[in-house]
């Protein structure tokens, strides 16, 4: 196999008895993406697969970047919070049991939720065989794979390969269509010697040799262009050091009252379980760990406040206190922990060292192609397509990996709008109620009438504003029974949610500023009722009073208007959103400084922003009754997050509104919190922390959609599968490995 050139088969070349291509899912634990480029010459077989087949620059692991959570994510398409295997070690207060890799408890089906690939295949009439895979020797939903091997790490790799080849030799009626294969290397060697070590190099040669044996065995059976093979890893690997340790004893006078899952992705819970599990004061722990040292190498979070892109909160097994640790550092209880040096993983899945490999080859896959990175939650849908079966519900976005396939099996389409919109019409230029708002600049009713008349756009003006400010179409509302209307202005368009009494979204385009002349002075101390929205559906300005710790923010920033007069279009109740005063500082800095920077760098950006309500922190928009539970004696619900989606043209010679090809996206989902303690901003100007904070909360457009019930880019003329690629793209700015 190795000596031959890449075969370019237009259709599957399967021998007699193989009606449809088998699928082999092959995992090499801890094979970080960088190894593939640094040591390619030492891995001729894997390198040939990379050259001849399709590969991604890397595949993103889910957080925490550990073995069991990611292997099970790969075969279910679910986030760890959804499938339940949230770490290699965990406690479930409802089961009152501990899960670990060294105990038989791991084979208790109660830990394993979701539907793994082997069951999806079996439920649809196919056989499945697993040569090791986390979960494969557990009776999930009462069933095991058709063929499985009890885990035994001492079985030589060659023996594993020859067994799998024997399975492929089984009579057609007994032969599986789906296979898994698992190697512990290069992870074991990476832990022992670190990622840059002779041990890893040796391990890479060993796994490459075994992989070559598989490919040679397939060739002997004339299956090398029949089998669809996916070679991937669960996560990467990074170096750790014994002088890069954070000890909890440096932060607490005593530590015996809590239990800590130590390492690169630490969690803290009560020591006395189950008794103290729910009464444990997690908030106090986070307070005591926040902004304690100038060079602190972890950030403490309550899990609902973690970046939403992590999807690591909604599970009782995920302890409320979470430490987000710096690259190559470890957080542990005390100096008695000497488990350092060598390699480790579990860190932030955006770190380049945590990136995993993804390569694929076979009749269904494109050849000699490199694709952009994607997340491992997408692999399950891809495997279902390869097997031509229906996936179980999962967190992947079906169709987003269609560009890997020669002929896609599943053709996605845009979601149908669930709640239709109306237009909030202009009836009277004078408000029937002031809504307790005031504007000292408008001294009489004639002036008020004048500025309100500006809200009454002609059809031509509406068409013009839509073209510029909604270049990819308005966001469609996928939530049920959401009464909302469109509000058109010359410089922005918004979708107003009547039940929430606030805009659901606001869309506007910031041009590349040709001149650097300052924006006109803003008229911030002025607010008035929007005459197009009935008072019963509007916010009252008196909602924003001091003892609520909440101030008014503008979703569309009034200062973005180029003239003082047009600012009045934004100084209206329909543009108001509730914001914590400290949050608003960050929000205002983003819009007045960072947004202009982005627009300048990208030849203009389209901005869509809005509130998010995710009180139950499940990553999905809350039902109205869930939000109502959190109304603190007020008519206006306080968002848990705000989103901002920046879209520009990939080809920077085009503006967003005239973009013929691919788009570039930069979405943010910023937790709406009363303080900025996450950034330790004391004594620091905004320039030193706001951008970093926004960057920490970058997300995918898809994450925004799930949290808002909105659907974006429906009017962008581009195949839906390409739009899905855009929506599942996560921008990253990590440069060092």
């Amino acid at each position: 196999w190795l000596e031959e050139n890449c075969d370019t088969a237009q259709q599957s070349q399967c021998p007699e008895g193989f009606d449809l291509p088998p699928v082999i899912l092959f995992s090499m634990d801890g094979f970080r993406a960088e190894y593939l480029y640094t040591w390619d010459t030492l891995m001729p077989n894997i390198n040939k697969l990379k050259t001849c087949g399709i590969h991604s620059k890397y595949m993103r692991a889910m957080y925490p970047t550990k073995t069991f959570p990611n292997h099970y994510t790969i075969v279910t398409g679910l986030y760890p919070e959804s499938h339940g295997i949230i770490d290699n070690n965990m406690y479930d207060v409802n089961l009152n049991k501990n899960f670990s890799l060294s105990s038989k408890e791991q084979n208790n089906p109660a830990w394993w939720h979701g539907q793994p690939m082997w069951l999806t295949a079996m439920y649809q009439g196919l056989k499945a065989a697993t040569y090791f895979w986390p979960g494969s020797e557990v009776a999930i939903n009462g069933s095991f794979p058709s063929i499985y091997m009890p885990y035994n790490g001492s079985v030589p790799f060659e023996e594993r390969i020859s067994t799998l080849l024997k399975w492929l030799d089984l009579p057609k009626a007994e032969r599986p269509r789906f296979y898994t294969m698992y190697f512990e290397e290069p992870d074991s060697s990476g832990h022992a010697g670190g990622p840059v070590s002779a041990r890893v190099i040796k391990a890479l040669q060993v796994v490459d040799h075994a992989f070559g044996m598989l490919m040679e065995g397939l060739k002997q059976r004339n299956l090398h262009n029949c089998v669809n093979i996916i070679l991937l890893a669960d996560h990467g690997m990074d170096q750790t050091y014994c002088n890069k340790m954070e000890y909890m004893t440096d932060y607490f006078p005593r530590i015996n009252f809590f239990y800590m899952y130590e390492g690169p992705a630490p969690r803290i819970r009560a020591h006395n379980i189950p008794h103290d599990f729910f009464s444990f004061n997690s908030e106090e722990i986070v307070r005591n760990l926040s902004c304690r040292k100038p060079d602190q190498h972890f950030k403490p979070y309550l899990t609902p406040d973690l970046p939403k892109r992590l999807h690591y909160a909604k599970n009782v097994r995920i302890d409320k206190v979470h430490l987000f640790v710096d690259q190559q550092w470890l957080a542990v209880r005390s100096k008695s922990n000497t488990n350092c040096g060598g390699g480790n993983h579990g860190y932030n899945n955006e770190f380049r060292s945590m990136e995993a490999i993804f390569l694929a080859h076979g009749p269904s896959f494109k050849e000699k192609t490199e694709v952009e990175p994607f997340e491992n939650i997408e692999v399950y849908n891809l495997m279902c397509d390869l097997l031509r079966i229906q996936p179980a519900p999962n967190n992947g976005t079906h169709g987003s990996l269609n560009h890997l396939l020669k002929v896609p099996f599943y053709e996605p389409s845009h979601a149908e709008e669930v709640s239709k919109f109306s237009v909030c019409g202009f009836a009277n230029p004078l408000p029937t109620e002031s809504l307790d708002c005031f504007c000292p600049h408008l001294q009489n009713s004639t002036q008020l009438e004048q500025v309100n008349q500006m809200l009454n756009l002609t059809q031509e003006e509406i068409t013009a504003t839509v073209k510029v400010n909604l270049p990819f179409g308005r966001p469609r509302v996928l939530q049920k029974n959401v009464d909302h209307c469109l509000l058109y202005h010359r410089e922005y368009v918004s979708g107003f949610g009547k039940a929430m009494r606030m805009p659901m979204w606001s869309s506007y385009t910031v041009p590349q500023l040709g001149d650097t002349s300052p924006l006109p002075p803003t008229v911030p101390d002025c607010l008035r009722a929007d005459v197009r929205v009935p008072p019963s559906e509007s916010q009252k300005c008196s909602f924003y009073l001091a003892d609520k710790n909440i101030t008014h923010g503008f979703l569309y920033p009034p200062a973005s208007n180029r003239t003082s007069d047009s600012q009045y279009d934004a100084l209206i109740t329909s543009n108001l959103v509730p914001m914590y005063e400290e949050f608003r500082k960050m929000w205002d800095y983003f819009h007045s400084v960072l947004l202009i920077k982005h627009a300048t760098e990208r030849n203009g950006v389209n901005v869509v922003s809005g509130p998010i309500f995710d009180y139950n922190y499940d990553g999905h928009f809350d039902a109205p009754d869930e939000i109502t539970k959190h109304l603190a004696n007020t008519d206006v619900p306080i968002p848990t997050h705000y989103f901002v989606v920046l879209t520009s043209c990939k080809n920077k010679s085009h503006t967003p509104e005239n973009c013929p090809g691919w788009l570039d996206v930069l979405p943010f989902i910023i937790p709406h919190r009363p303080t900025n303690v996450e950034s330790c901003p004391e004594g620091k100007p905004e320039a030193l922390w706001v951008e970093e904070r926004f960057t920490a909360h970058i997300a995918r457009v898809r994450d925004v959609e799930l949290l808002t019930g909105l659907d974006f880019y429906q009017d962008k003329v581009q195949p839906v599968s390409e739009i899905l690629q855009l929506k599942t793209y996560l921008p990253t700015f990590e440069t060092t490995i």
Partner: antibody, heavy 121, light 110 residues
């Protein structure tokens, strides 16, 4: 807890300019959420609003006093000031500085303790 | 002459209920919210009721406010001796383009 403290001379001669300063602590005068205002109360009488200002410098005043009033801000010192020119005996009052929420008319939630200014020769 | 009209005095015995009225016009009370302030002699006024009927934190629920048309009223139930003070109503006046106050009502607890 926000605190406001008025300071300035307690005695001003007729036709001169009354100058008072209000120092804010426990909160920033540069907050985008508040106006900072002056109110006065002649002895044994009711309250009268003089004028208010926003940290950016925009101000508005009681029309009956407007031509005589200047309100200014010094964000670096977290202070704002009142100047009332051409004073007469009718301007004798306790002068209060206060904070009110930007979006809502005239809800003064925090007040200084007040300073008595007597206009007399 | 104050823009908003209040009775100069009101009284009640401990435990009783007292009511203070405030009358304005369409340019003030009729088109916006009413706020009430309490001023104990020798001290600064304190916000007692805002937005017609909302109490800032720390104000007992014995104090309540209401508004109807161009008039408003403050009610104090279960009068206590410490309630003895001057009470001022206030509202934004659109024609003045600023806040206006009532002349104040001196409440005596007998």
């Amino acid at each position: 807890e926000v605190q406001l403290v008025e300071s300035g001379p307690g005695l001003v001669k007729p036709s001169e300019t009354l100058s008072l300063t209000c120092t804010v602590s426990g909160g920033s005068i540069s907050s985008s959420s508040y106006y900072w205002g002056w109110i006065r109360q002649p002895p044994g009488k009711g309250l009268e609003w003089i004028g208010s200002m926003y940290y950016s410098g925009s101000t508005y005043h009681n029309p009956s006093l407007k031509s005589r009033v200047i309100i200014s801000v010094d964000t670096s010192k977290n202070q704002f000031s009142l100047k009332l020119s051409s004073v007469t005996a009718a301007d004798t009052a306790v002068y209060y500085c206060a904070r009110h929420y930007i979006t809502v008319a005239g809800i003064f939630d925090y007040w200084g303790q007040g300073t008595l200014v007597t206009v007399s020769s | 002459q104050s823009v908003l009209t209040q009775p100069p005095s009101a009284s009640g015995t401990p435990g009783q209920r007292a009511t203070i009225s405030c009358s304005g016009s369409s340019t003030n009370i009729g088109s916006t919210i009413v706020n009430w302030y309490q001023q104990v002699p020798g001290t600064a006024p304190k916000l007692l009721i805002y937005s017609n009927n909302q109490r800032p934190s720390g104000v007992p629920d014995r104090f309540s406010g209401s508004k109807s048309g161009t008039s408003a009223s403050l009610a104090i139930s279960g009068l206590q001796s410490e309630d003895e003070a001057d009470y001022y109503c206030a509202a934004w006046d659109a024609s003045l383009n600023g806040p206006v106050f009532g002349g104040g009502t001196k409440l005596t607890v007998l």
